[in-house]
């Protein structure tokens, strides 16, 4: 049987069945992912549930930049440091940078300063690159 | 209930600097996640943004003024400053310090009328 | 000004009145729209937010929508203290800052 691979939206690009959009425009975070979720197809702010996934996404955004945070889709709804994927995915696989995460930091963004494989929080009402998810 | 109070000269000559200062009562700049913009409005026309900047010092300025224009935070005593270089009469405005939410300005301050004249 | 909005307005009271507000791609046609209302002599204030969000204390008589890069403010059952400058805004992502409206001045006859 021939498998056909997904296609994803143009400008977006393929990894192991999802596809992701990296949106070189600020929004805060709210706007961000109500812009995910216009795209249509189930789009959020992209969750990150594995070192191998991780790397993926930071190759592709390096090859476009290398100093600009990115909002991705990690929250702190109730400000109680009890974080949340904003698509409903299983908070498991962490790759947090080893700054401070007090004070009113409640959205993850991922961090240039490691090339985009770790993540730091910041305000949500901070204008951002950000970057969404779907499944197609 | 957060209020901002802008403060300023008045009456600048052409080619000097132009210093405000919008202090914040009612919130703390580094303990609220916000922007605090400055806009202004010549006498009689529309509404132009100028910058926003956060507690942090991340700052965006409008294209049309970023060669003049500088903001920066004083934490401590809770205000926000823009000073704008070379002035001439195309300056003269009321300038509004409002609280930016990444998105929207909401509250204002009352604004502060300035006149560059010689 | 990056934003095209009509310079006046006018309705009697009880009317309806309409204020369009036309960009572009890069504001009004990928960002939320704003609408502010500035009353003679006071400093401009939030009416609508996210193109038809109401923020609490404004009447439900203004709302605000968007098609495109076109969007609009309405105000039903005109009254005096509706007479005032309203300006709509967004964000530009061509020139990483906001944007306003030319502005519409409402008249209440």
């Known amino acids: 049987d021939i498998i056909m691979r997904p296609s994803c939206a143009p400008g977006w690009f393929y990894h192991k069945s999802n596809c992701y959009g990296y949106f070189r425009k600020l929004r805060n975070w709210s706007d961000a992912e109500l812009e995910c979720q216009s795209y249509g197809n189930g789009a959020h702010l992209a969750s990150i549930l594995s070192l191998k996934e991780a790397s993926t996404i930071a190759e592709y955004i390096s090859g476009y930049q290398r100093s600009q945070p990115i909002w991705i889709g990690l929250h702190d709804p109730q400000k109680r440091q009890q974080w949340q994927w904003i698509d409903g995915a299983m908070y498991l696989y962490r790759s947090w940078s080893g700054k401070s995460m007090g004070g009113n930091k409640h959205c993850a963004e991922m961090s240039s300063n490691n090339n985009f494989l770790t993540w730091s929080s910041n305000e949500c009402n901070k204008r951002q690159h950000f970057l969404c998810k779907y499944r197609p | 209930q957060v209020q901002l109070q802008e403060s300023g000269p008045g009456l600048v000559k052409p080619s000097e600097t132009l210093s405000l200062t919008c202090t914040v009562s009612?919130?703390?700049?580094?303990?609220?996640?916000?922007?605090w913009a400055w806009i202004r409005q010549p006498p009689g026309k529309g509404l132009e943004w100028i910058a926003s900047v956060f507690y942090d010092g991340t700052a965006d300025y409008s294209p049309s003024l970023r060669s003049r224009v500088s903001m920066s935070v004083d934490r401590s005593l809770n205000h926000v400053s823009l000073r704008l270089t070379s002035l001439t009469a195309a300056d003269t405005a009321t300038y509004y310090c409002a609280r930016d939410d990444g998105s929207s300005f909401d509250p204002w301050g009352r604004g502060t009328l300035v006149t560059v004249s010689s | 000004y990056v934003l095209t909005q009509p310079p006046s307005a006018s309705g009697t009271p009880g009317q309806r009145v309409t204020i369009s507000c036309s960009g572009s791609s890069s504001n009004t046609g990928s960002n939320y729209v704003y609408w502010y209302q500035q009353l003679p002599g006071t400093a401009p204030k939030l009416l609508i937010y996210?193109?038809?969000q109401r923020p609490s204390g404004v009447p439900d008589r203004f709302s605000g929508s968007k098609s495109g890069t076109s969007a609009s403010l309405a105000i039903s059952g005109l009254r005096s203290e509706d007479e005032a400058d309203y300006y709509c805004a967004a964000w530009d992502d061509s020139l990483s800052g906001y944007v306003f409206g030319t502005g519409t001045k409402v008249t209440v006859l």
């Open positions: 009612g919130d703390s700049i580094d303990k609220s996640s916000y922007y």
């Open positions: 996210r193109n038809n």
